[in-house]
């Protein structure tokens, strides 16, 4: 679907609406008629929509997970798939839609016990360099036949964050995915809460570093929903601001 393609980026890796990639303020993209992609640029055209390839759930939108499109298919070819709703089968938490988590192979609501809400930030927003998944779900790599002997530095091409050196993550920049610095305290980040909210992200930012989570900056609480500024902030012991 169109949404699957457009929403296939890391939750924290966003096009800079503030302070990032200057020179690309909402320029029109000559792609599908009548659609303006936030963060797009006039030099890009999408001739045909294709599934967004991925290696990690974090590369997909909040309402997606990364997996092989066919049951028993080639695990080396994975794309972002729509998340699974309540009572659907699952193998790991990321397969379940926001507000649910995977319990005994079934997506169940996390409303009763704030499980998903409380671990969401620590797993998807500040897992630092630990890119393991909760259910030990393994993935076959699809690296180039030229094996990389060293971890990618800033500006190195990558397929997944584990290709990058410590302190870096794998994020999209135009037609490639490259190693970029993980965000530090106080740096701007953006949290995508709704499907379709982040459009076609051609400039992705990394997630917040270890011990940090992406939250609304205190002095921006009064701002309108669309212009809330999120920054990487230190964890607090009590989180009561999760919205599902």
């Amino acid at each position: 679907t169109l949404n699957s393609v457009l929403n296939s980026n890391a939750i924290k890796n966003l096009p800079p609406p503030l302070g990032g990639a200057a020179g690309h303020p909402g320029s029109a993209v000559s792609a599908a008629p009548g659609i303006l992609y936030p963060g797009g640029n006039k030099y890009q055209t999408i001739d045909n929509y294709q599934p967004y390839p991925c290696a990690e759930d974090e590369e997909c939108g909040t309402d997606e997970y990364c997996a092989s499109p066919t049951r028993g298919g080639d695990a080396g070819v994975q794309i972002c798939l729509a998340c699974r709703k309540r009572r659907k089968r699952c193998m790991r938490h990321a397969m379940c839609c926001p507000g649910n988590y995977c319990k005994n192979g079934i997506c169940v609501s996390s409303d009763q016990n704030h499980f998903r809400g409380e671990i969401e930030e620590t797993i998807t927003e500040s897992f630092g360099n630990d890119h393991s998944t909760l259910d030990g779900y393994s993935r076959r790599t699809t690296l180039s036949s030229k094996m990389y002997h060293t971890k990618g530095q800033e500006g190195s091409v990558c397929l997944r964050s584990s290709d990058c050196a410590s302190g870096l993550c794998c994020a999209r920049h135009f037609w490639s995915k490259i190693c970029k610095p993980v965000l530090k305290e106080g740096q701007v980040c953006t949290k995508h809460r709704r499907k379709g909210s982040h459009g076609l992200e051609i400039f992705q930012r990394c997630y917040c570093g270890e011990g940090l989570s992406c939250r609304i900056q205190k002095d921006h609480h009064q701002a309108s929903n669309s212009s809330r500024l999120h920054t990487c902030q230190r964890h607090h012991h009590h989180h009561h601001h999760h919205h599902h």
Epitope: V5, P16, A21, Q50, P53, S144, K146, Q153, G155, F203
Partner: antibody
Framework: EVQLVESGGGLVQPGGSLRLSCAAS????????ISWVRQAPGKGLEWVAS???????YYPDSVKGRFTISRDNAKNSLYLQMNSLRAEDTAVYYC???????????WGQGTTVTVSS | EIVLTQSPATLSLSPGERATLSCRAS??????????INWYQQKPGQAPRLLIY???KQGSGIPARFSGSGSGTDFTLTISSLEPEDFAVYYC?????????FGGGTKVEIK
Amino acid sequence: EVQLVESGGGLVQPGGSLRLSCAASGFTFSSYAISWVRQAPGKGLEWVASVSGWLDTYYPDSVKGRFTISRDNAKNSLYLQMNSLRAEDTAVYYCATSLENYAFDYWGQGTTVTVSS
Amino acid sequence: EIVLTQSPATLSLSPGERATLSCRASESVDDFGISFINWYQQKPGQAPRLLIYAGSKQGSGIPARFSGSGSGTDFTLTISSLEPEDFAVYYCQQLKEVPPTFGGGTKVEIK
């Protein structure tokens, strides 16, 4: 060993069409972005088009609407369909990939396109 | 688009000398903590070869005598001691924004 081999260049009249090909080997072709860059005789380098691993495409204004970049991952091949050719399109056309670094780090040997009547 | 201006257009030096090539961008090419500037070497009849990416990082198999520095709008490629095979044309390129643009080149020739 990473290899990129261009073909399809030649002499064509203004207004004519040409299709360039680039055969890639030595890496997982489908995973990486690949581009066309050209160099007019005695001039500098000019980016022509790029296609990502997820198949979105990018062009400069100078070729937009006339050139189309495409890739066939099953054949490890990149293409550049050039229509409505002009004299100023005369150049050596290189395919280049961003395999290790966010740069054009591997290049083919180039294929020459001459647009003249 | 971002315009890159290279200077000098020609640099006449002898083997063993130090070469300093400049590349100035019309606006900052830094973003996400990275300088999106690359340097290439091209010899007559050959394809360009990547020397430096992300402002200062060496490409694969590039000799240590080639180094890149700078940030924002001003960048420098330094060849610490010219070897006979280093006489060529050098291009800088920005990849911060589409369209990617190249500088006009600096020709390093034998004095």
